[in-house]
């Protein structure tokens, strides 16, 4: 059977939007009228994965685009990247662990959690026009809550 | 008072490391991104290095990849620039500068001069 | 990486004179340019940000226009101390990238 997926929009705790920031990285800044239209629109795959009540495994990629969120170790730390794959392949419902985030829903805001690194989460900064990244911090100054908006296909 | 002095800096071989210091005061550090730029003598400004307040957050310029580190200490108001593997072209003073909104550098300090020479 | 592009590279000009600085992005950067001031021997000041913004302190005579790809800088009434090396900085995208800088001379 094919991937389950949806269109949506991420903004963080803060009501930050992420847009692209140059060809393989996002970032997060605030953003009204016409220029919400600069934000990413993700296609979020439910994959393969450890599963349970509130730990949703997906993907996410770029909509229309060859691109997906992937974990990676740079210099011997956890880095969040975004990756080119070949469209004919992707996505598939066995993805790569790099490309796993475990969707964990608490008090109706979502965290994303690396599945390749456990304790790393998608996060953002409380400032302005600064790249999302990936954070082995919660609860800290870094944002890793985030809310999801659906985008209609 | 927003001050920022940099230390650290002085002659060194190729191949060699220094570490440079920056230390800051008048504002709360822990709160601020914080960047390393460079000029090299008679020329102009390159950016080298980001870091977040948590310091969870870094970035490099290409030329320095994997051979610059760049850290913070929030208890000791301070950041660091380790670097290794020295090169000639590295020759610069090294400036430290808060980052302010949206990513530019409204406050700096007044540099330190590195010197790779052999 | 985005590349700025500043002209001119240096001008002669008298105190009083109305000066305009460009500066031009290889991408769209949106808004997000700053220009800094810079003087022998000492750091670059802060000057605008967010293309149009005067940082707190910068004398009004100072301006910034631009969105996107081209922005410039004026220089109202040229004043003594204003005679320094200007650069252009991007932040739309790391790694951020500075002009090659425009140096204004007094005539």
């Known amino acids: 059977a094919p991937v389950r997926s949806l269109n949506c929009t991420l903004r963080d705790s803060q009501q930050k939007s992420l847009v692209m920031s140059g060809p393989y990285e996002l970032k997060a800044l605030h953003l009204q009228g016409q220029d919400m239209e600069q934000q990413v629109v993700f296609s979020m795959s439910f994959v393969q994965g450890e599963e349970s009540n509130d730990k949703i495994p997906v993907a996410l990629g770029l909509k229309e685009k060859n691109l997906y969120l992937s974990c990676v170790l740079k210099d011997d730390k956890p880095t969040l990247q975004l990756e080119s794959v070949d469209p004919k392949n992707y996505p598939k419902k066995k993805m790569e662990k790099r490309f796993v985030f475990n969707k964990i829903e608490i008090n109706n805001k979502l965290e994303f959690e690396s599945a390749q690194f456990p304790n790393w989460y998608i996060s953002t900064s409380q400032a302005e026009n600064m790249p999302v990244f990936l954070g082995g911090t919660k609860g800290g100054q870094d944002i890793t809550d985030f809310t999801m908006q659906f985008v209609s296909s | 008072e927003v001050q920022l002095l940099e230390s650290g800096g002085g002659l060194v071989q190729p191949g060699g490391s220094l570490r440079l210091s920056c230390a800051a005061s008048g504002f709360t550090f822990s709160k601020y991104f914080m960047f390393w730029v460079r000029q090299a003598p008679g020329k102009g400004l390159e950016w080298v290095s980001v870091i977040s307040p948590s310091g969870g957050m870094t970035r490099y310029a290409d030329s320095v990849k994997g051979r610059f580190t760049i850290s913070r200490d929030n208890s000791k108001n301070t950041l660091y620039l380790q670097m290794n593997s020295l090169r000639a072209e590295d020759t610069a003073v090294y400036y430290c500068a808060r980052v302010g909104y949206g990513g530019n550098s409204d406050y700096w300090g007044q540099g330190t001069l590195v010197t790779v020479s052999s | 990486d985005i590349q700025m592009t500043q002209s001119p590279s240096s001008v002669s000009a008298s105190v009083g004179d109305r000066l305009t600085i460009i500066c031009r992005a290889s991408q769209d950067i949106n808004r997000w340019l700053a220009w800094y001031q810079q003087t022998p021997g000492n750091a670059p000041k802060l000057l605008i940000h967010s293309a149009t913004s005067l940082q707190s302190g910068v004398p009004s005579r100072f301006s910034g226009s631009g969105s996107g790809t081209d922005f410039t800088l004026t220089i109202n009434s040229l004043q003594p101390e204003d005679f320094a090396t200007y650069y252009c900085?991007?932040?739309?995208?790391?790694?951020?990238?500075f002009g090659g800088g425009t140096k204004v001379e007094i005539k």
């Open positions: 900085q991007q932040a739309e995208s790391f790694p951020l990238t």
